[in-house]
């Protein structure tokens, strides 16, 4: 056969040769020839390559900068990048998690629908009728209004989305 024009999986074409790619965790030192195999070297400390490749340089592991609220969630290897996450009370600003912002709080009248994680912000929802929230909080859900009837009391002041009902004693003259 003549020299190939296409190569198998995990190979690449160079100078009419099909050369083996370097495995994840290794970088290319020299291309194969008619007489020699591809030469690869392991990535150094704090470096990685996560695919079969012909890269001559390994990538640096991501740095989780504490000044940006970041910490290491999973330490990188020669084949994987470091995964960063945010400190408690903070979440990533993007999928790449390059910086963090403080979890937002839900204002009075709103409750927490979903508590924030290292990668997602707090999700708030308006307190529906029958529920209220009178605090700004990143954890508190909307609370149901107090049921005056179960306490043998009557509603003296109606509740809102921000305030509970005010219960009072029943008017005895109205027996």
């Amino acid at each position: 056969p003549e020299p190939p024009t296409a190569c198998r999986e995990k190979q690449y074409l160079i100078n009419s040769q099909c050369c083996s790619l370097c495995q994840p965790g290794q970088k290319l030192v020299s291309d194969c020839t008619e007489f020699t195999e591809t030469e690869c070297l392991p990535c150094g400390e704090s470096e990685f390559l996560d695919t079969w490749n012909r890269e001559t340089h390994c990538h640096q592991h991501k740095y989780c900068d504490p000044n940006l609220g970041l910490r290491v969630q999973q330490k990188g290897t020669s084949e994987t990048d470091t995964i960063c996450t945010c400190e408690e009370g903070w979440h990533c600003t993007s999928e790449a998690c390059e910086s963090c912002v403080l979890h937002r709080s839900c204002s009075p009248g709103f409750g927490v629908k979903q508590i924030a994680t290292g990668v997602s912000d707090t999700i708030c929802e308006p307190c529906p009728v029958g529920f209220f929230s009178n605090v700004s909080s990143a954890f508190e859900k909307c609370h149901p209004w107090t049921s005056c009837e179960t306490k043998d009391l009557v509603v003296q002041q109606a509740g809102t989305n921000k305030t509970d009902v005010v219960c009072g004693p029943q008017d005895r003259l109205r027996a």
Epitope: S20, S30, F35, E37
Partner: antibody, heavy 112, light 112 residues
Amino acid sequence: DVQLQESGPGLVEPSQSLFLTCSVTGYSITTNYNWNWIRQFPGNKLEWMGYIRHDGTNNYNPSLKNRISIIRDTPKNQFFLKLNSVTTEDTAIYFCTRLDYWGQGTSVTVSS
Amino acid sequence: DAVMTQTPLSLPVSLGDQASISCRSSQSLENSYGNTFLNWFLQRPGQSPQLLIYRVSNRFCGVPDRFSGSGSGTDFTLKISRVEAEDLGIYFCLQVTHVPYTFGGGTKLEIK
């Protein structure tokens, strides 16, 4: 086109050192490939002696023990064979080669 | 070392005939990547060896398609489909999978 050319003395005395030069044109010896010395004895038997790689490291035929050294001069794009303590058994035609391209060969006789 | 045994030693042919040369290694020439570095060379009288086939079956540039290589592991074959006058000379196999590189003893292709 890649070309290789050997040069050196045609006659060496026993126990002396043989020193041959290979001049390469058309390709840098630091780019890739192994740059080999091969010899052909009377009767046509071929023997691989060793190589210097593009990165300057070596591999030698263990049969030549500690007699062989291959070095290079990268600015001149040349590599060299030094064979110590020669005997009449080292009489041969010496080729420098990348294996796909060969020099024309230089005949070396070991004799007093 | 990988000992390369070439047969026959001499191969008398008529022009236009098919010729077949065998090369057998004392150990497998397939490396851990699944590649086999077995080469065939022709040395015409008074000339340097020239590369015909590399990696078992790949024709080197400019080599006529009447030359073909095949085989795997330890057994390899060079075939010339229709011998021409310019094909006469000595054929060598060379393995470069293992160090030291080793040659077969050669097969002389000559006119009957």
